[in-house]
Amino acid sequence: VLEVYYTSLRCRCVQESSVFIPRRFIDRIQILPRGNGCPRKEIIVWKKNKSIVCVDPQAEWIQRMMEVLRKRSSSTLPVPVFKRKIP
């Protein structure tokens, strides 16, 4: 399980995965734009098993999933996506 926590750089992701995660295992996805002391965009997947995974924003699967979600943004999203900056 990949750990997610605050570091001195205020980035939350220490390690990132590029492995595909089926949607039925996902509770929600959090997108943290770069800024506030973290020089990179971060994507955090909160899973139904209560574990948390940082996903490489360059991973093909997450880019494809985000594109699908963007296309469906006018209707209810099957996977809640939260975009916010770290306070």
Epitope: L2, S17, F20, R23, K47, K48, N49, E60, M65
Partner: antibody
Amino acid sequence: EVQLVESGGGLVQPGGSLRLSCAASGIDFSRYWMSWVRQAPGKGLEWVAEINPERNYINYAPSLKDRFTISRDNAKNSLYLQMNSLRAEDTAVYYCARQDDYDKYAMDYWGQGTTVTVSS
Amino acid sequence: DIQMTQSPSSLSASVGDRVTITCKASQDVNTGVTWYQQKPGKAPKLLIYSASYRYTGVPSRFSGSGSGTDFTFTISSLQPEDIATYYCQQYYSTPLTFGGGTKLEIK
């Protein structure tokens, strides 16, 4: 060492019922999704059903959901498949498999299977 | 349901050959594809997950690629112990579905 051992297979008449069991050892059974997959003689693999640890997410192959019921007992490290109204086409080797939902998200450990024969 | 069409259904190759198996999904499955190896009378073994990731202990001659609807499984240099049937499977959504299998034989 991870071990999944299926049991409960055998010969049953059409219309009959059977309950398969899968005993798990060497894994923290209560943390993982589990699946049943079957294979008819000389044929390919067919997914049957899956269940999550809390038993609140259960999915079936559409053609089987009216007759088959997947369940589990985390205290006994056991997975079950209740099969009712059995038909000749249900004859197969039935495998249980652990479905990793931590870092691979695939069926990474399989039992050796138990054979179900439906015949009069 | 998502159909997984695997080809060829059987193939014969020589030791040292490069072997390629393809799998086509009936709809986009992102990179949610695994490849399994099954030897007669045995349970399937996971080789590749997430389309291209080798499972622990799997030799480097096995590889996978693809995304969306088209996937490829390759054995770079066939070994005698690779004789088996290989299956692709999509785990993008339920019901999980398998390809029909490719039976690999030695020439």
